[in-house]
């Protein structure tokens, strides 16, 4: 999987979209590692 900063951000955006945004507030690109996916 792509682990660049941009890939991580897009992947998290997709995850947030699928979850309806119901995730922890601190679940943001800069403090989740690729392992979070």
């Amino acid at each position: 999987a792509c682990d660049t900063a941009t890939c991580v951000t897009h992947r998290l955006a997709g995850l947030l979209s699928r979850s309806g945004g119901v995730v922890k507030n601190n679940f943001v690109p800069t403090n989740v590692g690729s392992k979070a996916f």
């Epitope: 660049t4 941009t6 890939c7 951000t9 897009h10 690109p29 800069t30």
Partner: antibody, heavy 119, light 107 residues
Amino acid sequence: EVQLVQSGAEVKKPGASVKVSCKASGYTFTDYYMNWVRQAPGQRLEWIGVINPYNVRTTYNRKFKGRATLTVDKSASTAYMELSSLRSEDTAVYYCASLLIRPHYFDYWGQGTTVTVSS
Amino acid sequence: DIQMTQSPSSLSASVGDRVTITCKASQNVGTNVAWYQQKPGKSPKALIYSASYRYSGVPSRFSGSGSGTDFTLTISSLQPEDVATYHCQQYNFYPYTFGQGTKLEIK
């Protein structure tokens, strides 16, 4: 409203250094990576590097490693790009850019800072 | 580094035309490609991410496709305000790299 506001144009002599700032507003600065890109006249866009403002980790384009330094001032929501040992080929417009999810899912760019290197 | 080769480097088309710009990566970058529009003297504006997804606010006449090494940006019906230079970018690998740009003009 999300804004990335960059510092003004600079004229530098060869061998000098330049430090460009990028003041972020309208979002949580430490939540999103900050990229730096430049565009020399008539040349393609060129990625310099990226900084994680949360933990201040950086990744650089090898071409700029050792000459470019990315830093942040979290309290001022400002990112900086310093380029040293300037040469004429560094004459370019320098941009900061950040891909956000909130408040809007969009890739925001600063207005650009023109750096001219001339003796 | 990944080379991104755009074609054509410039093109002239009429209002209402369908316009296609291609970008070829020197190796597989999945769908991790973005497209930007840049008007003279302005910053690049994001249009497309993940090869085929439009950012909110981008007109539906812009579409992207492709995966692996071959990517396309299509403008279904060219408008006068589309005069600009278009750039592709891969972000699958560091360093991110851009195509050389395609300058689009109106006939």
